[in-house]
């Protein structure tokens, strides 16, 4: 029957940061198309980007629904032109994905550091709340809304003149840190999950600097 | 829907172990907190601590380190706190609850307990 | 380790509004303590209210919520029923550890 000339696809893998999640898979096709489904463990299978030439499937608009199920793709191959045809056992050529789940998986974005404020010998800094594609009540929620007591801020900051560098942790989006009068200081973040085995931490943000224009400097 | 079942009543003698049990039904076990709460009477809810089955993480109250032990199966779906060096103060029930933690955070199923008595 | 204090006894009629608070030893009670309201009734049955400060369990009645008053978490009863009658506790979460409260043992008559 159809199997001649369709192949199966092979490296499908997960993509995901901050939720949103796109599954890839290859190869290029030549003389075919794919479609995909994803499902839950206990759910119906949901078909997805139908027929497409793509190497790819967005689907954040699924795993969205609930970020802390595992879920499941696979990718479907048929003939171009000729989408009804089968394979020998009656059914299309297709793949599974590994499992996926989400909350566990997507990986962290990298952070921003909002503004700092110097006020003394204390300077306050803080993470923009990032905006995530997972929704509540038509909302979109930030990362610490659904991740809550699961995600900290580590903070790198550092004397423009020197390179030694001092840490920080916060399980909220501000870090109040001593700084020595009259010296600039440079900041970086990172984001973390310290409950995961995999994609525990972010990259770090870019670097802010005093000095620049992001900081409010007050002599009190 | 959500349940969390525990093991039965436990008699044990001084210096021994205990191992509870909390099988959960109805969601993605590995997905959520499991958290550990003893009560005695007159003495309210103490926490415990907390297992992530997904990674096995756990984070301990300092007075029970060295006295519990969490693990996880996520082939089962089962949760396990482990009571070691037992003495008349660990005589108590031990609950489990699922930490629906995020944006709707709350504990918000529990298991029926597990009657703990350590008597010689 | 933090204390976290209730009030060990309330009483308040049915209909009336009453609220439960509690205190951190250790400062302000904030978002990111997440605040966790339990009741408990006879049998040993527990059930969560309210978590994450003011976010309704599903299936709790809306005369339960959960709020930031001055330097407090406080659990609002309004228009309180006799089936309300219960002991309440909280939770408040301090980087890596949960701290309960000692509860509020609440009648309703």
């Known amino acids: 029957s159809g199997t001649t000339n369709t192949v199966a696809a092979y490296n499908l893998t997960w993509k995901s940061t901050n939720f949103k999640t796109i599954l890839e898979w290859e190869p290029k096709p030549v003389n075919q198309v794919y479609t995909v489904q994803i499902s839950t463990k206990s759910g119906d299978w949901k078909s997805k980007c139908f027929y497409t030439t793509d190497t790819e499937c967005d689907l954040t608009d699924e795993i969205v629904k609930d970020v802390k199920q595992t879920y499941l793709a696979r990718v479907f191959s048929y003939p171009a032109g000729n989408v009804e045809s089968t394979g020998s056992a009656g059914e299309p050529l297709y793949e599974n994905s590994p499992e996926f789940t989400p909350y566990l998986e997507t990986n962290l974005g990298q952070p921003t550091i909002q503004s700092f404020e110097q006020v003394g010998t204390k300077v306050n800094v803080t993470v923009e709340d990032e905006r995530t594609l997972v929704r509540r009540n038509n909302t979109f929620l930030s990362l610490r809304d659904v991740f809550g007591k699961d995600l900290i801020y580590t903070l790198y900051y550092w004397k423009s003149s020197s390179s030694g560098k001092k840490t920080a942790k916060t399980n909220t989006n501000e870090f109040l840190i001593d700084v020595d009068k009259g010296e600039n200081y440079c900041f970086s973040v990172q984001a973390v999950i310290p409950s995961r085995t995999v994609n525990r931490k972010s990259t770090d943000s870019p670097v802010e600097c005093m000095g620049q224009e992001k900081g409010e400097f007050r002599e009190i | 829907q959500v349940q969390l079942k525990e093991s039965g009543a436990e008699l044990m003698k001084p210096g021994a172990s205990v191992k509870i049990s909390c099988k959960a039904t109805?969601?993605?076990?590995?997905?959520?907190?499991i958290e550990w709460v003893k009560q005695r009477p007159g003495h309210g809810l103490e926490w415990i601590g907390e297992?992530?089955?997904?990674?096995?993480?756990?984070n301990y109250n300092e007075k029970f380190k060295g006295k519990a032990t969490f693990t996880a199966d996520t082939s089962s779906n089962t949760a396990y706190m482990q009571l070691s060096s037992l003495t008349s103060e660990d005589s108590a029930v031990y609950y489990c609850a699922r930490d629906r933690n995020g944006y709707v955070n709350y504990f918000d199923s529990w298991g029926q307990g597990t009657t703990l008595t350590v008597s010689s | 380790q933090a204390v976290v204090t209730q009030e060990s006894a309330l009483t308040t009629s049915p209909g009336e509004t009453v609220t439960l608070t509690c205190r951190s030893s250790t400062g302000a009670v904030t978002t990111s303590n997440y605040a966790n309201w339990v009741q408990e009734k006879p049998d040993h049955l527990f059930t969560g209210l309210i978590g994450?400060?003011?976010n309704r369990a599903p299936g709790v009645p809306a005369r339960f919520s959960g709020s930031l008053i001055g330097d407090k978490a406080a659990l609002t009863i309004t228009g309180a029923q006799t089936e309300d009658e219960a002991i309440y506790f909280c939770a408040l979460w301090y980087s890596n550890h949960w701290v309960f409260g000692g509860g509020t043992k609440l009648t309703v008559l």
């Open positions: 994450g400060t003011n």
């Open positions: 109805g969601y993605t076990f590995s997905s959520y907190w």
């Open positions: 297992i992530l089955p997904g990674s096995g993480s756990t």
